[in-house]
């Protein structure tokens, strides 16, 4: 039960309070008390529960009623069973008692009032009327957790609006408020109990801007509501009227967590005692509500697609058509950003990252942009916010990024266990330097520290500076799996292409083509290839990076070797020692439910079948899955990107709740 | 055959900032290594910075690392040096050059550790 | 003072050959076969005329050859003609933090 306030009571004359429902009330019997009195009895009206403790306990007078000796080891404490229908009409009376002197007694008067702030901390979508309880000013997590949920509104409803939602302090319709969180005030007073108290709500300064909150007026419309707390306004005096009432706040997220805000927001209403006007207002009662804001959730492979965006760039008809085809297969909307919109600038994966946020009423979309702000740069803003899905962006708007900042360099995990430690929504993954030096590129510092502060999706660093363009989704990528852990972790592996090409040779074809039906390029023989000492030796420093990383996986995401895969794939060493594949990447693949779309990687054909392509499918086709191998070679891979680069995804959100995890 | 065209300078005090574009024509400049290199009246070659055909990677001279910043817009076909603090040693012609990074080449060819096309440069003078 | 050393001044008569020396370290010359050679005329922009120790661009004539020993690369001029009079200078890869190397450069007289 929630603290209340200190009574004192004197013989002198009556004392009047107020007794908020729910909450334990002190009362000081004892520092007023008539100096040669040594004991005290208590009587109260029925509404009235009077508590006393006293060690050792107290004699039973042969009247029936109980006294106790006045000193400080008496603790008398007292709630009320229902609201006052008027002013102090709930009545203790404190008789003091001494060897020589006939009772003397101390009147209280009280006032029984019911006032809760009220909101969804049970997390079941709906919001249950919730007396002053201790419990509603801490969050939890977990199953068994409790607290209320915050979204971001971060979408833009209004499609007029270049905006989002929560750059204003106005709400445009029902759909704007259902972005919201309802938070009820419920008030039962005396009619005359506002005439001498007041009601404020506020929010702690260092929240004041991550928030705001608007007041329902007179039924729940929209264009009925008006901001009562937000970035200028930290308080906001209510007019309350006197007897039963609820009151509706709808309050809205204007950040995501982050370093400097851990995500939580507190929502206060004080009760004021305002009766002696000649006399500062004092403090009387409190009542909270924790709000947690919802984190921003990246999706992995392993979730179902809704949704494929891709560029259409000068002469890539044949490569649209391709994941045209793959999305119709997979049964996904697909979105196709035209010339005039992408400025030539092709690589959808790399400017933004779908994922999702949500509270217990409702999920919403939420494009994370990176800020390598190149072509694209107006596509997420401009294309993917809108009516309910959301828009988010950290790090430098005008240079400072490096190639690292690209989200091609940023993929999740499927959910993993590792121990005892459960991440029901897997793990975040980016690509680093090994280790900083003048010349090493790393994701920039507020995406990482954005991407940590989510809580739910514990990054993991990854090695990724050694290749040319320094993403992650080079070297590895995530397939579902119907055994198993449900998945299967792809990594590029220069060891099996050298192992698959010594056997096509020992099998005599030595002489058969990488690279055949490419105008304009080198066709390699595979005896040409396997005798390349440099190539070799390249290949031999790349096997040893990406052996890094499936070391630093195995441990980070309780992975065994079983669950990983190795796709056969050469790199070459360019300049700056930086590395990039030789033939088509085929790690860097499109992945839509059971359907896969690869990067053709032109390998030597054998049989009238690519070898590479075979052993591909031998890997993945025992898993469910289809293969379909496309034509990327020179609209994207000469450009040092492939498929996936290519694409982007929006992914259905995971059945699990976030807040029933423990990060 | 790629053909640069170097813009920006000027006299500015020390201290100050200016920035020098090296506009392509005749090729697509996305498809190229771009270098700075800079010499001061009477003086040798000095490599400044570099940028990768793949707008992904960044090199500097320790001379200029943290003051310069190199750039590219594929889109107009140009490369950028942003120099800010700048020094009275900063004084120089500051040449555009390039290499085209040939995806054709089984192994390192160095493309980018040399400059096959350069530009006519552009006088930056510091001085107060 | 540069961070690969040239002779300040070579000279040579026309028809004959003349060779201008580039040392450096292991950690460049040494190490890395990306040395390049560049002629420079009075008021000119430079001119590639050697990449990867002994490469030559299309266009430039066969009397230009590069060659590497340890850590010195060298460039050789046979069959001097009067338009070779120019400052040469070389380049290397580095594996400091200055990536890119330039020699101090030569002025070759054709006398």
């Known amino acids: 039960m929630a603290q209340g306030t200190l009574i004192r009571v004197t013989p002198e004359q009556p004392t009047h309070a107020v007794c908020v429902l729910g909450t334990l009330t002190q009362l000081d019997v004892c520092s007023s008390a008539p100096e040669d009195c040594t004991s005290f009895s208590v009587n109260t009206s029925p509404g009235v529960v009077v508590d006393i403790a006293h060690s050792p306990p107290a004699k039973k007078k042969s009247t029936g009623s109980s006294t106790w000796p006045l000193d400080p080891g008496v603790e008398v404490t007292l709630t009320m069973k229902a609201a006052s229908g008027s002013t102090g009409d709930q009545k203790v009376q404190i008789s003091y008692h001494g060897p020589k002197t006939p009772p003397v007694k101390a009147l209280l008067y009280l006032t029984g009032v019911e006032i809760s702030l009220s909101a969804d901390i049970t997390r079941t979508g709906k919001v249950k009327p919730t007396r002053a309880v201790e419990d509603k000013r801490t969050w939890t997590w977990g199953p068994c957790g409790q607290g209320a949920i915050l979204l971001v509104n971060c979408d833009r409803d209004n499609p007029e609006s270049s905006a989002m939602d929560c750059e204003d302090d106005e709400v445009l319709d029902s759909k704007d408020l259902k972005d919201m969180s309802l938070m009820t005030l419920s008030t039962k007073t005396p009619q005359d109990f506002f005439t001498r108290h007041t009601l404020v709500l506020h929010v702690a300064r260092s929240e004041m801007d991550k928030v705001r909150v608007f007041q329902a007026t007179r039924g729940r419309l929209s264009s009925r509501c008006r901001v009562v707390l937000g970035p200028k306004q930290p308080s906001h005096y209510l007019m309350v009227p006197g007897g039963k009432h609820n009151m509706d706040f709808y309050v809205e997220a204007l950040a995501f967590p982050d370093t400097n805000f851990p995500g939580l927001i507190t929502l206060t209403v004080s009760m004021l005692d305002t009766s002696k006007l000649e006399l500062p207002e004092a403090v009387v009662f409190q009542d909270s509500v924790v709000f947690r804001v919802a984190p921003w959730i990246m999706t992995p492979n392993t979730q179902p697609p809704q949704e494929v965006y891709v560029c259409s760039i000068f002469e890539n008809e044949d490569f649209l058509k391709s994941v045209t085809a793959l999305a119709m297969q997979a049964r996904c909307k697909l979105t196709i950003c035209p010339e005039e919109e992408n400025m030539d600038d092709q690589w959808m994966q790399d400017e933004m990252e779908i994922g999702y946020i949500q509270a217990p009423h409702k999920t919403l979309p939420v494009v994370f942009d990176s800020p390598r702000n190149r072509g694209l740069k107006e596509f997420p803003i401009k294309r993917v916010m809108g009516p309910d899905f959301g828009y988010v962006t950290r790090g430098p708007q005008t240079g400072g990024v490096s190639g690292l900042d690209s989200f091609g360099n940023l993929e999740v995990s499927p959910p993993v266990t590792v121990g005892d430690k459960e991440y029901p929504l897997g793990r975040i993954l980016f690509g680093d330097s090994c280790y900083p030096s003048s010349d090493s590129r790393e994701m920039h510092q507020a995406l990482q520290d954005f991407l940590s502060a989510q809580q739910v999706q514990a990054p993991v660093k990854l090695y990724s500076d050694w290749l040319t363009v320094g993403h992650v989704d080079e070297f590895l990528s995530f397939v579902p799996a119907p055994d198993r852990k449900g998945f299967r972790l792809l990594l590029a592996s220069p060891r099996s292409c050298y192992k698959l090409f010594q056997e096509q040779q020992n099998e005599g074809h030595g002489d058969a083509l990488l690279f055949q039906g490419i105008k304009k390029k080198n066709q390699q023989k595979i005896k040409n290839i396997l005798s390349n000492t440099t190539l070799r030796e390249h290949n031999s420093f790349v096997e040893r990076c990406i052996d890094w990383n499936r070391e630093l996986l195995k441990r980070e995401l309780g992975l065994a070797e079983s669950d990983i895969i190795d796709i056969p794939q050469l790199f070459k060493l360019k300049e700056f020692s930086k590395a990039e594949a030789f033939f088509p990447n085929m790690v860097n693949m499109l992945v839509l439910g059971k359907h896969l779309g690869i990067p053709k990687p032109f390998g030597p054909i054998i049989n009238g079948r690519c070898c590479l392509e075979e052993k591909v499918c031998s890997l993945l086709e025992p898993l469910g899955l289809h293969c379909t191998f496309i034509n990327d070679f020179y609209t994207y891979h000469i450009r040092h990107g492939e498929v996936h680069c290519g694409t982007n995804v929006r992914r259905k959100p995971f059945s699990f709740k976030w807040w029933n995890m423990v990060p | 055959q790629v053909q640069l065209v170097e813009s920006g300078g000027g006299l500015v005090k020390p201290g100050g900032s200016l920035r020098l574009s090296c506009a392509a024509s005749?090729?697509?400049?996305?498809?190229?290594?771009v270098s700075w290199i800079r010499q001061a009246p009477g003086k040798g070659l000095e490599w400044v910075s570099f940028?990768?055909?793949?707008?992904?990677?960044?090199y500097y001279a320790d001379s200029v690392r943290g003051r310069f910043t190199i750039s590219r817009d594929n889109a107009k076909n140009s490369v950028y040096l942003q120099m800010n603090s700048l020094r009275a040693e900063d004084t120089a012609v500051y040449y555009c050059s390039s290499a085209n990074d040939d995806v054709d080449d089984i192994v390192a060819p160095g493309r980018g550790y040399y400059m096959d096309v350069w530009g006519r440069g552009t006088l930056v003078t510091v001085s107060s | 003072q540069s961070a690969l050393t040239q002779p300040r001044s070579v000279s040579g008569s026309p028809g004959q050959s003349v060779t201008i020396s580039c040392t450096g370290t292991s950690g460049d010359v040494g190490r890395y076969n990306h040395v390049s050679w560049y002629q420079q005329h009075p008021g000119k922009a430079p001119k590639l005329i050697i990449y990867n120790v002994y490469e030559r661009p299309s266009g430039v004539p066969d009397r230009f050859s590069g060659s590497k020993s340890g850590n010195t690369a060298s460039l050789t001029i046979s069959g001097l003609q009067a338009e070779d009079e120019a400052d040469y200078y070389c380049s290397s890869h580095s594996r400091s933090s200055t990536p890119v190397l330039f020699g101090g450069g030569t002025k070759l007289t054709v006398l």
């Open positions: 005749g090729s697509t400049l996305s498809d190229y290594f």
């Open positions: 940028i990768s055909s793949a707008n992904t990677f960044t």
